[in-house]
């Protein structure tokens, strides 16, 4: 493994940096003077960006809003004024930009209408923001217009009525395929799941709702589940919580045939003031926060077998607030496996866990090298790295940005943090780690806005400060040296960067103001990085390594989930491009099978530092409750399952004799008979 | 009672370094934190920094962050705080301050402060060429 | 890091009579805030934290109240005792940081 950012490298500068990187930026002034400016890409690698920028001014009886909208083709270099596309509309920033999915160029705007209006109207586009469509809405629309994933011209929306309207030819014309809906979302297939209110609205059925399925675009409707709260979409899995017969609890069942069949997670019950949520969910299996009985804002993290029905306790004390809904569970892109989220100790104070092999075992986050812990440390040499994310960010701790990984700069993960015992409420620092969260090392002093550029060939920051700034720091070793570029005389109110989604571009925005006494004026610099980069990388430049490599020893080294990755990484010395069409190079090896690669099935348990599953001692000899496709099941087992995405072969296969547990269902939720089909008529 | 009591005055020559001592007792020395604060003459207090006498973990104020090191003897509840590379406007009295709250962040629960609640009497650090 | 900004800088005050003391946060600092009186030729003493809870042996006469960025330190009756600075300081984000003072004067 590479080791971690060296702090007391001996920086070279690069040559000429300063004249390379002066011809690549370009200033736009955007000549109005809007309160809030909202930004847009259109497509995957078109250069495409749109610019929303908004100016309200709230009167006695009416607001008096005006927006005007900006089209760069260049990434952002150039910007056009395209108000006059949009008949210079104000447009309502809640409903935001809806972008089509993929490279389908579609975008849809919602316009503010006046008040006596009879429905909504949208501006539409289907070649990437050259022309507009005005197209008058037969309803007010609630939430923004989603696109099906599979079809960009279908499109579902809410009204503020609560009807569900479907639209099959990119919003030019409307239909309501049913009322009283309280939440619509895709599934696969143009698939369109919903649930509707029986008797008086969506806040009073809550847990009284129908479940609904229609996957002909409206013409026909199977209702899928009553008694239902809520429900969600995950990976393969549908999820519905679903209130008990005999008190006010509901329970997770799901179902992995978009509601044909219907099984009871094993998962505990919730009251009426907690809830369910799915963390992170993929083709394999799902992680679950139950949240814990009392205003306590935690929880339970548990993770899910191939089924999405048998689960395994993966972490307690998970904090989760129940009031902001803020949790800092974050999937790390750059390496397969790897989670980190924040537990609430018992002195209420937070500590950060990282997982490497999907929720199996958390641990602390190991502590940078040459760092000093501080003062939440009971032991001065010993502490750990403490990761601050969505909580620090809505608590205000100074903190701008939440951790970033990027799938395609493999083992790269940036993310403000605090060494000692515990998150403290002292000026953060960032923090790099170049193998998945293994290790770290300290990137910058105090807290910054960062971004990663050509997959990883460069990593660009701006200091986070109240006062104007105008220099950018970057650094094409993986964060170990930077160098400071000033790219404009006169600095500016930072409000963000921007680089086009996938971080493989070279290009990065910087978005501000400047401030006069009565104007403030919005302005972007945008700085190409590809004089910086202006080799392609070649083969000699990449080198090989082994993820999740611990103890390079043993033969099992680098085995996650019954099989190790080796991949080619760029060399930190190496100052070349790894390009637009840069695909990360792996090599896939499956690992042998041991007992750390099986999870124990229903009825099961593993004893805190055992191996082995053993049957639950409450268990034995008695009738579970248990339902299996909504109907009293017969379940054999031997205790073991591998675990969802395992991969191993050979080596040890938990064999023992194959129990036949008798299950009684005790879930009415749905019985075949229950479910019926309708047409719309 | 509890009680901090601090080191007498100090005069020193710009660059030297000064090293305050502040004397805990009258409770567990180990169970608080311990906050440094100074007042240049005429001035309001600035907030330099806080030591874990548990385990003798620190957080600098980023301003002091490299001239100023904070320590403690667990054997004679002391701690000691060193600043160097004096200059003349580190002229001040620098007060200990017994500091409960610390510094972790806190849950949904909130993060409750109760303030400095027992103070040293004070060291008279002079810089002067 | 948090600017905390006290007004008035001085406040002529006659015994007996109430004082009213402002402290203003450059944001949020929630109720981390505690208010200290300084005499010459004295420690800082702690009068009130948590924003609005009096400290052991302060007489009732002093009171806190505020949350998030605007707090008030109050004297209903003003003791000859009480003619001091008074200073608040935030422990919400690091580093700590004080107002700049209230002198209260004897009028």
């Known amino acids: 493994r590479r080791g971690a950012p060296a702090e007391d490298q001996d920086c070279g500068r690069l040559p000429d940096f300063i004249a390379k990187l002066t011809n690549n930026t370009h200033q736009h002034v955007f000549d109005d003077l809007s309160g809030s400016v909202s930004l847009s890409w259109v497509g995957d690698s078109t250069g495409v960006i749109l610019v929303l920028t908004t100016f309200q001014v709230p009167l006695v009886i009416v607001s008096f809003g005006q927006s005007k909208l900006y089209r760069s083709e260049d990434y952002g270099k150039n910007f056009k004024d395209i108000t006059n596309l949009i008949n210079n509309t104000f447009i309502r920033t809640e409903f935001g930009m809806a972008i089509g999915p993929e490279n389908s160029g579609k975008v849809i705007l919602t316009a503010e209408v006046s008040g006596g209006s009879r429905g909504g109207r949208v501006f539409r586009s289907s070649d990437f923001a050259k022309n507009f469509v005005q197209t008058d809405l037969p309803f007010h629309p609630l939430t923004q217009m989603m696109y099906s994933p599979q079809n960009s011209d279908y499109l579902l929306a809410l009204s503020t009525e609560n009807g569900l309207w479907v639209s099959k030819n990119f919003g030019e014309k409307w239909e309501e395929i049913h009322k009283a809906v309280c939440l619509a979302k895709w599934g696969p297939n143009n698939i369109i799941f919903f649930t509707t209110h029986v008797n008086g609205s969506c806040k009073a059925d809550l847990g009284a709702l129908e479940l609904w399925r229609t996957s002909d675009l409206g013409k026909t409707f199977k209702t899928i589940g009553v008694k239902i709260y809520s429900f969600g979409l995950g990976g393969r899995f549908l999820f519905a919580s679903v209130m008990a017969d005999k008190d006010t609890t509901r329970r997770i069942h799901v179902s992995t045939d978009q509601g044909d069949t219907w099984s009871m997670a094993q998962l505990p019950s919730v009251g009426q003031e907690q809830f369910y949520s799915i963390l992170a969910a993929n083709e394999d299996m799902v992680f679950m926060h139950v949240d814990e009985p009392g205003d306590t804002g935690f929880g339970t993290i548990f993770t899910s077998d191939d089924r999405g029905i048998v689960y395994s306790k993966s972490l307690d004390r998970h904090l989760y607030t129940t009031t902001g809904g803020e949790t800092d569970f974050t999937n790390v892109t750059s390496l397969r496996g790897v989670y980190i989220t924040s537990t609430l100790s018992e002195d209420n104070s937070i500590q950060s866990m990282i997982t490497f092999d999907q929720g199996g075992r958390w641990e602390h986050l190991r502590k940078p090298e040459n760092s000093k812990c501080d003062a939440t440390a009971k032991n001065k040499n010993e502490c750990s790295l403490h990761i601050h994310a969505s909580y620090s960010i809505s608590q205000k701790l100074n903190v701008p940005m939440a951790p970033l990984s990027e799938p395609n700069a493999v083992g790269i993960v940036i993310a403000h943090g605090s060494v000692g015992d515990a998150i403290s409420v002292m000026v953060p620092d960032v923090y790099i780690s170049d193998d998945g969260g293994y290790s770290w090392a300290k990137m910058l002093e105090g807290p910054h806005y960062y971004t990663i550029l050509d997959s990883g060939g460069i990593i660009v920051a701006i200091e986070h400060s109240n006062r104007p700034i105008n220099v950018i720091k970057f650094s094409t070793d993986e964060g170990q040296c930077w160098q400071s570029y000033v790219f404009t005389q006169e600095p500016i109110y930072f409000t963000g960067l921007a680089s086009e989604p996938g971080a493989r571009s070279m290009n990065i925005s910087i978005w501000g103001f400047t401030e006069s006494f009565i104007t403030r004026q919005w302005v972007s610099y945008t700085v190409d990085f590809k004089d910086i980069l202006e080799r392609n990388c070649e083969e000699d430049d990449y080198t090989t390594w082994l993820a999740h490599s611990t103890d390079p020893g043993d033969y099992k080294d680098g085995c996650i989930l019954g099989y190790k990755e080796q991949f080619l990484r760029l060399r930190k010395s190496s100052v070349c491009q790894n390009g637009r069409d840069y695909v990360v190079a792996k090599q896939p090896s499956v690992c042998p099978c041991s007992l750390e690669d099986f999870l124990c099935d229903f009825g099961y348990f593993r004893p805190e530092n055992a191996s082995e599953c053993v049957e639950q001692p409450e268990l034995k000899g008695h009738e579970l409750e248990f339902c299996l496709y909504g109907k009293e099941e017969h379940l054999t087992t031997n205790g073991y399952r591998k675990i969802p995405g395992d991969k191993c072969q050979g080596g040890m296969n938990p064999a023992r004799e194959v129990k036949d547990l008798k299950k009684k269902c005790t879930s009415n939720f749905l019985n075949p008979t229950k479910q019926n089909s309708k047409s719309n008529s | 009672q509890v009680q901090l009591v601090q080191s007498g005055a100090e005069v020193k020559k710009p660059g030297a370094s000064v090293k305050v001592s502040c004397k805990a007792s009258g409770y567990t020395f180990t169970s608080t934190y311990m906050s440094w604060v100074r007042q240049a003459p005429g001035q309001g207090l600035e907030w330099m920094g806080i030591i874990n006498p548990y385990g003798g973990s620190t957080s600098y104020a980023q301003k002091f962050q490299g001239r100023v090191t904070m320590t403690r003897d667990t054997s004679t509840s002391t701690v000691y705080m060193e600043l160097s590379s004096l200059r003349s406007e580190d002229t001040a009295v620098y007060y200990c301050a017994r500091d409960p709250s610390g510094i972790a962040a806190a849950g949904p629960a909130s993060r409750y402060y109760y303030g400095m609640d027992v103070w040293g009497q004070g060291t008279t650090v002079t810089v002067s060429s | 890091e948090i600017v905390m900004t006290q007004s008035p800088a001085t406040l002529s005050v006659s015994p007996g009579e109430r004082a009213t003391l402002s402290c203003r946060a450059s944001?949020?600092?929630?109720?981390?805030l505690a208010w200290y009186q300084q005499k010459p030729g004295q420690a800082p003493r702690l009068l009130i934290y948590?924003?609005?809870t009096r400290a052991t042996g302060i007489p009732a006469r002093f009171s806190g109240s505020g949350s998030g960025t605007e707090f008030t330190l109050t004297i209903s009756s003003l003791q000859s005792e009480d003619f001091a600075v008074y200073y608040c300081q935030q422990a919400r984000l690091g580093p700590w940081t004080f107002g700049g003072g209230t002198k209260v004067e004897i009028k």
């Open positions: 944001q949020s600092v929630s109720s981390n």
């Open positions: 948590g924003a609005s």
